[in-house]
Interface confidence: medium
């Protein structure tokens, strides 16, 4: 019995299908053939989890977060035993192996493994800003998102004509920050930060007012 | 050590509303699947619902004699699992236990249970 | 909706065996619970995934599923099992849980 080498990973976007896939060669009738899926989870390396079994010709759920979600890409039994996870979730993240047995052919590599990711876009980032708005005053415009897989990256623009920051402005986009030193006039105006990994963007608007100091009566 | 802590149970007049909450220790709360089930008065088990780990999608699922009348929420950094009871009636008399769901389907863990009683 | 029939009660002598059954349409094709719960107590968990054991709980305790009836075997009863026994089966379509009526294990 040998199990085919598998693409090493899988990426899939939060909600969607993933298949994950395993095929074997066998000398013998598929009459006692025994599969089990099992996987290492990201968030939890120590804790192995069954997704689903197939054994004496019957399947069994594996671990209750897999229940309905789970299932042989094709009719069992096949030597195509790939699998398919419906509505994908960040917790799908992690190791799958394969674990293959085919009485009463032994020997050879009964074991697949392929990596799963399940990607998520950035959320609804969140625009603040820290710091006084007075005239001359540092200001640090603040961007983040909650989720977002692989960690976002924040790109900061001015909603003007050129769509440039201003020149005294300094951009993070790891951390999401501008710090803007020695605000004017010039500062003031309609911010967007666009919050972006490989599967999507989402932005944010902030409105920063420079306050003019008021003249004073003699 | 796992522990599960129920509070907020009393006497409510029927129509009325009342806040469960459960607060949990000895393991990764987030992590968890978390359920409520109760059990009227000389009665047997009846599950109330049950709330997924955030990263599970959080999603909710209810027996149908309490859906659209109780809603169950989660606070992970404060550990903690609530059932919202509105619309509350005499039927609804029980003791409420939080439960968490083991990653292969039973609660292996239970709280001491919280006594709700709906009277007039 | 989906039901699990439990015998009500069932009565066994010192060190004899006993068996309590919980029906339900095609539990076998399903994961089958028991729990067994002391007057004024919690629920605790005996038998997971049809008839694993958790940790903590002596071997007499067992379990099996197939066809329309999982069974709780307790072998070599003790007084201390004295309690009620509560099946419990996961419905993977709705995502909800169905409990067994319970049965009183009483020890003579």
């Known amino acids: 019995l040998e199990v085919s080498e598998s693409p090493g990973s899988v990426q899939v976007a939060r909600g969607q299908t993933a298949v994950l896939p395993c095929a074997f060669s066998t000398s013998a009738a598929l009459l006692n053939l025994n599969v089990i899926w099992m996987v290492i989870p990201l968030s939890n390396a120590n804790q192995p989890e069954q997704v689903i079994l197939y054994q004496g010709g019957q399947m069994f759920d594996g671990a209750l977060r897999f229940h309905g979600r789970v299932g042989f890409t094709g009719t069992m039994p096949a030597t195509n035993v790939s699998i398919f996870i419906n509505n994908t979730q960040l917790s799908d993240t992690g190791t799958y192996q394969c674990l293959v047995n085919n009485l009463p052919d032994r020997g050879g590599r009964n074991i697949g493994v392929t990596g799963l990711t399940v990607l998520v876009p950035p959320s609804a980032p969140q625009c603040q800003i820290q710091g006084s708005q007075d005239l001359g005053s540092d200001v640090i415009l603040l961007c983040s998102s909650e989720e977002g897989i692989p960690r976002p990256t924040y790109l900061w623009e001015k909603l003007d004509n050129t769509l440039k920051l201003p020149p005294t402005a300094t951009q993070d986009q790891v951390q999401g920050t501008v710090t803007i030193r020695n605000i004017s006039a010039l500062s003031s105006g309609l911010y967007q930060c666009v919050a972006s990994n490989a599967i999507g963007t989402s932005t944010c608007l902030l409105d920063l007012q420079v306050i003019s100091p008021q003249p004073r009566s003699v | 050590e796992v522990q599960l802590v129920e509070s907020g149970g009393g006497l409510v007049k029927p129509g009325g509303s009342l806040r469960l909450s459960c607060a949990a220790s000895g393991f990764t709360f987030s992590n968890a699947w978390m359920s409520w089930v109760r059990q009227a008065p000389g009665k047997g088990l009846e599950w109330v619902g049950r709330?997924?780990?955030?990263?599970?999608?959080?999603?909710?699922d209810y027996a149908a004699p309490v859906k659209g009348r109780f809603t169950i929420s989660r606070d992970d950094s404060k550990n903690t699992l609530y059932l919202q009871m509105n619309s509350l009636k005499t039927e609804d008399t029980a003791v409420y236990y939080c439960?968490?769901?083991?990653?292969?389907?039973?609660?292996?863990?239970w709280g001491q249970g919280t006594l709700v009683t709906v009277s007039s | 909706s989906y039901e699990l029939t439990q015998p009500p009660s069932v009565s066994v002598s010192p060190g004899q065996t006993a068996s309590i059954t919980c029906s339900g349409d095609k539990l076998g094709d399903k994961y089958a619970s028991w729990y067994q719960q002391k007057p004024g107590q919690s629920p605790v968990l005996v038998i997971y995934q049809d008839s694993k054991r958790p940790s903590g709980i002596p071997e007499r305790f067992s379990g099996s599923n197939s066809g329309n009836t999982a069974t709780l075997t307790i072998s070599g009863t003790q007084a201390e099992d004295e309690a009620d026994y509560y099946c419990?089966?996961?419905?993977?379509?709705?995502?909800?849980?169905?409990f067994g009526g319970g049965t009183k294990l009483t020890v003579l």
């Open positions: 419990l089966s996961y419905l993977a379509r709705s995502g909800s849980v169905v």
């Open positions: 439960a968490r769901l083991h990653i292969y389907g039973p609660f292996d863990y």
């Open positions: 709330i997924k780990s955030k990263t599970d999608g959080g999603t909710t």
